[in-house]
């Protein structure tokens, strides 16, 4: 089969780092300078990706494989492949159209990307609040009041959280 | 202009080796692909080895264990070592560096 299928399209012959050249009756040819094929009975080569700008490069192109680009500190990779670079934010922030804001009270984001969450609402599991949350943080659940025997313990469900100097934007 | 002149072919028997030598005027290393083709009679020029733009050596599977291409830029001369030579590696070969291609060098592997 294979020999058949040669036969047929001997461009199925073009291993990776080649492409089948039509203008040189259907040989194989190297890839040109900064172009590559991954795959073999390619009819063209692919540019190679530029990392630019804010993307870096994590691995140069060769004849065979794409550069990969991740990004510059400071911003980190979406998409797939890392096709877009979002500024970072600080923990305890999400990033909106107007730039990096805090978390509103009650929600908290523990990394430098993403959306703020909400905090953990012990209660639907029946629990207490052991540790407030805070703008970074979630909250950390105890055992319900109900398993804490008179005596058992000297914990006291908290006040509730208020973030000090975090006035309306 | 740029030329590319292979030597080096010859009458071998099986098992024996040659080394071929493709020597090029003109500063087209930089800029280039080298590779060596051959083309048996009635068949078609079919790629060999080749040393690719990132300065990596690619073999076909035919050439794979028995064939080493190698490059001296401050010659301007790209080499095929070939070892454990078959009858079926009898062909003219012919070097190349993106268009311009040489005369070629005939081998004949024969017992």
């Known amino acids: 089969f294979e020999r058949t299928r040669s036969l047929q399209d001997p461009c199925s012959n073009c291993p990776a780092g080649t492409f089948c050249d039509n203008n040189r009756n259907q040989i194989c040819s190297p890839c040109p300078p900064n172009s590559f094929s991954s795959a073999g009975g390619q009819r063209t080569c692919d540019i190679c990706r530029q990392c630019k700008g804010v993307f870096r490069t994590r691995k140069e192109c060769s004849s065979t494989s794409n550069a990969e680009c991740d990004c510059t500190p400071g911003f980190h990779c979406l998409g797939a492949g890392c096709s877009m670079c979002e500024q970072d934010c600080k923990q305890g922030q999400e990033l909106t159209k107007k730039g990096c804001k805090d978390c509103c009270f009650g929600t908290f984001n523990d990394q430098k990307r993403g959306i703020c969450r909400p905090w953990t609402n012990c209660s639907l599991d029946g629990k207490s609040v052991l540790v407030n949350g805070t703008k970074e943080r979630d909250v950390v659940c105890g055992p319900s009041p109900a398993d804490l025997s008179p005596g058992a313990s000297s914990v006291t469900p908290p006040a509730p959280a208020r973030e000090p100097g975090h006035s309306p934007q | 202009a740029v030329q590319l002149v292979e030597s080096g072919g010859g009458l071998v028997q099986p098992g024996g080796s040659l080394r071929l030598s493709c020597a090029a005027s003109?500063?087209?290393?930089?800029?280039?692909?080298s590779a060596w083709y051959r083309q048996a009679p009635g068949k078609q020029r079919e790629l060999v080895a080749w040393i690719a733009w990132d300065n990596v050596a690619h073999y076909a599977d035919s050439a794979k264990g028995r064939f080493t291409i190698s490059r001296d830029n401050t010659k301007k001369t790209t080499y095929l070592q070939m070892n454990s030579l078959k009858l079926e590696d009898t062909a003219a070969y012919y070097c190349?560096?993106?268009?311009?291609w040489g005369q070629g060098t005939q081998v004949t592997v024969s017992s």
């Open positions: 190349n560096s993106g268009d311009f």
């Open positions: 003109g500063n087209i290393f930089s800029i280039h692909v």
